[in-house]
């Protein structure tokens, strides 16, 4: 991956509406060093999208990804 592990990505905006669940292949949490907590969903096209971890749909997607 070109996005090396020595960087600490942070999010400053959240996606406003849910992505299609089928488009998402994985996720990660941003660092606690960031000013805003965030979940980053990675799509099947390798795009990275910031989402609000407090949103119900985000928690549901995480649970779904953990079970798949």
């Amino acid at each position: 991956s070109p996005y090396s592990s020595d960087t600490t990505p942070c999010c400053f905006a959240y996606i406003a509406r849910p992505l299609p669940r089928a488009h998402i292949k994985e996720y990660f949490y941003t660092s606690g060093k960031c000013s805003n907590p965030a979940v980053v969903f990675v799509t099947r096209k390798n795009r990275q999208v910031c989402a609000n971890p407090e949103k119900k749909w985000v928690r549901e997607y995480i649970n779904s990804l953990e079970m798949s």
């Epitope: 070109p2 960087t7 942070c10 999010c11 400053f12 965030a38 795009r47 990275q48 999208v49 989402a51």
Partner: nanobody, 124 residues
Framework: EVQLVESGGGLVQAGGSLRLSCAAS????????IGWFRQAPGKEREGVSC????????YSADSVKGRFTISSDNAKNTVYLQMNNLNPEDTAAYYC?????????????????WGQGTQVTVSS
């Protein structure tokens, strides 16, 4: 060492223009989109514009559409933000940032690298 270096800020009268530059080094330019954020005192950071280094696709916030134009010179690893018809509400520190890999979801994309910023002040 990764570097994003902004330049071109300054003081301008309302209705005037500025061109900001963001020179990138230390990473593969084609793997990232380069975006501009701005932050005015006491306000949230706002995603202004973005350009994909790989295919040239762009994003502009509604607040700057028709006034700000983003462009890229991949040979120089540099992104430009041409700002026309500036108004006092555009006064802010402007930062360039690297986000993978394109502008589809900008500004709701994780930022991997930041510049130090350049100040733009628009007087009325």
């Amino acid at each position: 060492e990764v570097q994003l270096v902004e330049s071109g800020g300054g003081l301008v009268q309302a209705g005037g223009s500025l061109r900001l530059s963001c020179a990138a080094s230390g990473f593969n330019f084609d793997d990232y989109a380069i975006g501009w954020f701005r932050q005015a005192p006491g306000k949230e950071r706002e995603g202004v514009s973005c350009i994909s280094s790989s295919d040239g696709s762009t994003y502009s916030a509604d607040s700057v559409k028709g006034r700000f134009t983003i462009s890229s010179d991949n040979a120089k690893n540099t992104v430009y933000l041409q700002m026309n018809n500036l108004n006092p509400e555009d006064t802010a520190a402007y930062y360039c940032a690297a986000a993978p890999p394109d502008c589809t979801y900008y500004p709701a994309t994780p930022i991997y690298y930041w510049g130090q910023g350049t100040q733009v002040t628009v007087s009325s």
